[in-house]
């Protein structure tokens, strides 16, 4: 799996999970989230050569096609596969609210 | 939806469905498929600016982040959303076989 266990420990230019910290105020301008200050969101990046973690039959076809016709820019792309939620604390007036924001943290990637 | 009805009728540099015909022998080197000779596979391509058909909360976060730090290459990517199968005819010896290959045709796209 193209997850932290593999991607963070290897030199990998192909599609893989990359660490990325997001600061809510600084990076997104979101001032309404009280806690946490930011979080390890991660992201997916890298090339998708033939058979590199292809998600579907179409992505396998596309990556094979791309080896013959690279100028077509019709290659698969490295995107998130497994995502996890993030628990946040915010306030409505003086009332604290705890909420789970779904699909906020990328755990693994795929070529799609 | 970023499907043929919208994308094939509009000039759209952002993420959208693009037409692509794949010839099995010429483009993939697959000589085993007897019929069809090829098919309209389509593919997804284009930019994923903030809120353009974002698939998840993470892709919305990422596209917003990317406006501030484009050099990070941490932007969402335009990939297939809905896929359809393709029915093919091939032979094992002289025996014809009909099979449905799943996820061969892209019908719509998303930013993920």
């Amino acid at each position: 799996a193209l997850d932290a266990a593999y991607c963070f420990r290897n030199v990998q230019d192909n599609c893989c999970l990359r660490p990325l910290y997001i600061d809510f105020k600084r990076d997104l301008g979101w001032k309404w989230i009280h806690e946490p200050k930011g979080y390890n969101a991660n992201f997916c990046a890298g090339a998708c050569p033939y058979l590199w973690s292809s998600d579907t039959q179409h992505s396998r076809v596309l990556s094979l096609y791309n080896t013959i016709n690279p100028e077509a820019s019709a290659s698969p792309c490295c995107v998130s596969q497994d995502l996890e939620p993030l628990t946040i604390l915010y306030y409505i007036g003086k009332t604290p609210k705890i909420e789970q924001l779904s699909n906020m943290i990328v755990k693994s990637c795929k070529c799609s | 939806a970023l499907d043929a009805a919208y994308c094939f009728r509009n000039v759209q540099d952002n993420c959208c469905l693009r037409p692509l015909y794949i010839d099995f022998k010429r483009d993939l080197g697959w000589k085993w498929i007897h019929e069809p000779k090829g098919y309209n596979a389509n593919f997804c391509a284009g930019a994923c600016p903030y809120l353009w058909s974002s698939d998840t909360q993470h892709s919305r976060v990422l596209s917003l982040y990317n406006t501030i730090n484009p050099e990070a290459s941490a932007s969402p990517c335009c990939v297939s959303q809905d896929l359809e199968p393709l029915t093919i005819l091939y032979y094992i010896g002289k025996t014809p076989k009909i099979e449905q290959l799943s996820n061969m045709i892209v019908k719509s796209c998303k930013c993920s």
């Epitope: 420990r9 030199v11 600061d23 | 990070a72 941490a74």
Partner: antibody, heavy 119, light 107 residues
Framework: EVQLQESGPGLVKPSETLSLTCTVS????????VHWVRQPPGKGLEWMGL???????RYNSALKSRLTISKDTSKSQVSLKLSSVTAADTAVYYC?????????????WGPGTLVTVSS | DIQMTQSPSTLSASVGDRVTITCLAS??????LAWYQQKPGKSPKLLIY???SLQDGVPSRFSGSESGPEYTLTISSLQPDDFATYFC?????????FGQGTKVEIK
């Protein structure tokens, strides 16, 4: 063990290009970002620029026209090139890593290498 | 660029003293501040990040706090190993900028 090590000529002539290499071990350049920071003798620290794990770069606008940072991931090396140097570029040059890309503070530093600009 | 004004530039203290160094940011940096210790001929060592988070392996006598645009590094009980120069750094906006440094010397 995470390590960074700067190397390059200790003396560069004015108007020439300063070239330094940062060789890293214990982590991958496709996972972490690497920054360059310099410190003139007896003075404070100046952030010069960085190279992302994905290969993109960001430079201090004060140096942007003269600075190029690149990397060779297979060799675990990051390079710095600073053109048209003057005596004001005499400094100890450090490469450093941020603990998570976009955290922007530096948890590991190289020992630094002194570069003197003089004819 | 965000200016980081650090004070004092030099501080004379004795072992066991409580020492405070301050850094004033020219604009809001939303707690995106780090503190480093540097000894002569050595590279800086990270002490504190996010204004108050202690880096792994750093003694608990070091602490960070903030009050508006002013950020403070406190050494609760100065040890012989703490005589060094200390720098603050904002990690909020490009280009990342440092304070001019505070040299803590033996009284």
């Amino acid at each position: 063990e995470v390590q960074l090590q700067e190397s390059g000529p200790g003396l560069v002539k004015p108007s020439e290009t300063l070239s330094l290499t940062c060789t890293v071990s214990g982590f991958s350049l496709t996972t972490y970002n690497v920054h360059w920071v310099r410190q003139p003798p007896g003075k404070g620290l100046e952030w010069m620029g960085l190279i992302w794990n994905t290969g993109g770069t960001r430079y201090n606008s004060a140096l942007k026209s003269r600075l190029t940072i690149s990397k060779d991931t297979s060799k675990s090396q990051v390079s710095l090139k600073l053109s048209s140097v003057t005596a004001a570029d005499t400094a100890v040059y450090y490469c450093a890593r941020d603990p998570v890309p976009n955290k922007w503070h530096f948890d590991f530093w190289g020992p630094g290498t002194l570069v003197t600009v003089s004819s | 660029d965000i200016q980081m004004t650090q004070s004092p530039s030099t501080l004379s203290a004795s072992v066991g003293d409580r020492v405070t160094i301050t850094c004033l940011a020219s604009e809001d940096i939303y707690s995106n501040l780090a503190w480093y210790q540097q000894k002569p001929g050595k590279s800086p060592k990270l002490l504190i990040y996010d204004a108050r988070s202690l880096q792994d392996g750093v003694p608990s006598r070091f602490s960070g706090s903030e009050s508006g645009p002013e950020y403070t590094l406190t050494i609760s009980s100065l040890q012989p190993d703490d005589f060094a120069t200390y720098f603050c750094q904002q990690h909020h906006a490009y280009p990342f900028t440092f304070g001019q440094g505070t040299k803590v010397e033996i009284k």
